[in-house]
């Protein structure tokens, strides 16, 4: 008799299969131990890391990972060819760009090679797991006496990303933030020339090419005002 455990984590295809883990119910067999959950992130659609918590195993175990793409030309089962290690135990797998198909359902299977029946399968939508690189080349332009425009670049297709700009002055205790769409441009209409401003930006693969929840790292900050703006009042791009 097999017990089927459903372990949805919000990334499964709700119109198709949930995540399935089948475990024999042999009394106190090692097979009944659940396998750790696999977490995958696609970094700027350049490579993908799928990792698990290897320390959750009762004893050090080199778990193996297989993957395939459901209902597609890429449905052949593939072995992980580049394992990641934590204290000499497998703790993840890195897939290269050519192995990543964002818009096909990615199926990942973790297995205990010493107990082949002990396996867990998850289905992931990779377009919801993309994390872009942090924005680069932040620049500030003075549009008028009191208006600043912040621009930046991303190393990805512009329309696939949305952005979050944060700024504050040296007098502020917290950041003010503003969402920005794919146009990657932000204007601050009222700037106090007596204050020093700091700006930073992060980006997310949402909503036009995917529905990712995770943001990139913050960009390097850029500063404007008081002791810096005198050097060039029309263009300033100093990274801290």
């Amino acid at each position: 008799l097999n017990t089927t455990i459903l372990t949805p984590n919000g990334n499964e295809d709700t119109t198709a299969d949930f995540f399935l883990t089948t475990m024999p119910t042999d009394s106190l067999s090692v097979s009944t131990l659940p396998l750790p959950e696999v977490q995958c992130f696609v970094f700027n659609v350049e490579y993908m890391n799928c990792t698990w918590n290897s320390s959750s195993e009762p004893q050090p175990t080199n778990l193996t990972l297989h993957y395939w793409y459901k209902n597609s030309d890429n449905d052949k089962v593939q072995k992980c060819s580049h394992y990641l290690f934590s204290e000499e135990i497998t703790s993840g797998c890195q897939l290269q760009k050519k192995e990543i198909h964002l818009y096909q359902t990615f199926v990942v299977q973790l297995q205990d090679p010493r107990e082949p029946r002990r396996q867990a399968t998850q289905m992931l939508k990779l377009q919801n797991l993309v994390i872009p690189w942090a924005p680069e080349n932040l620049t500030l332009h003075k549009l008028s006496e009191s208006q600043l425009e912040l621009n930046w670049n991303n190393r990805f297709l512009n329309h696939c990303l949305e952005h979050l700009v944060q700024y504050r002055t040296d007098w502020d205790h917290s950041w003010t933030e503003q969402s920005v769409d794919y146009r990657h441009k932000f204007s601050l209409p009222s700037v106090d020339g007596q204050k020093r401003y700091t700006f930073r930006v992060r980006s997310r693969f949402n909503p036009l090419c995917g529905s990712a929840q995770h943001w990139s790292e913050w960009s390097h900050p850029i500063h404007w005002g008081s002791n810096t703006s005198k050097e060039n009042p029309f263009l300033f791009a100093l990274e801290a």
């Epitope: 659609v45 597609s72 964002l102 818009y103 377009q127 297709l157 036009l208 090419c209």
Partner: nanobody
Framework: QVQLQESGGGSVQAGGSLRLSCTAS????????MGWYRQAPGNECELVST???????YYTDSVKGRFTISQDNAKNTVYLQMNSLGPEDTAVYYC???????????????????WGQGTQVTVSS
């Protein structure tokens, strides 16, 4: 910085031909799906043709047999050869870039202003 620059538009008589070009920079061209959209005054943005990174092509029904999409990875350029043009093809044509696999497995309506300035094609009868 990601940039798409269209060229090759112009005015032509019905039955004539034009070849549109789009030069891309700032992203990995040969790992992207490319496409052409068009927008006539008062109309929505319409997907005309796409070419995927593996060479698969798509054409909207109204241009099948008349338009041909192709790409030159060495030049980071995608082309749209348009033959037997009619007045109904009059529009601004926009070049588009998408993540690999977007067109064949995902899709979704696009606004033409996501990309470049476009190139005007005018066909008179």
């Amino acid at each position: 910085q990601v940039q798409l620059q269209e060229s090759g538009g112009g005015s032509v008589q019905a039955g004539g031909s034009l070849r549109l070009s789009c030069t891309a920079s700032g992203f990995t061209f040969d790992d992207s799906d490319m496409g052409w959209y068009r927008q006539a005054p008062g109309n929505e943005c319409e997907l005309v043709s796409t070419i995927s990174s593996d060479g698969n092509t798509y054409y909207t029904d109204s241009v099948k047999g008349r338009f041909t999409i192709s790409q030159d990875n060495a030049k980071n350029t995608v082309y749209l050869q348009m033959n037997s043009l009619g007045p109904e093809d009059t529009a601004v044509y926009y070049c588009a870039a998408e993540p690999r696999g977007y067109y064949s497995n995902y899709g979704g309506r696009r606004e033409c202003n996501y990309w470049g300035q476009g190139t005007q094609v005018t066909v008179s009868s």
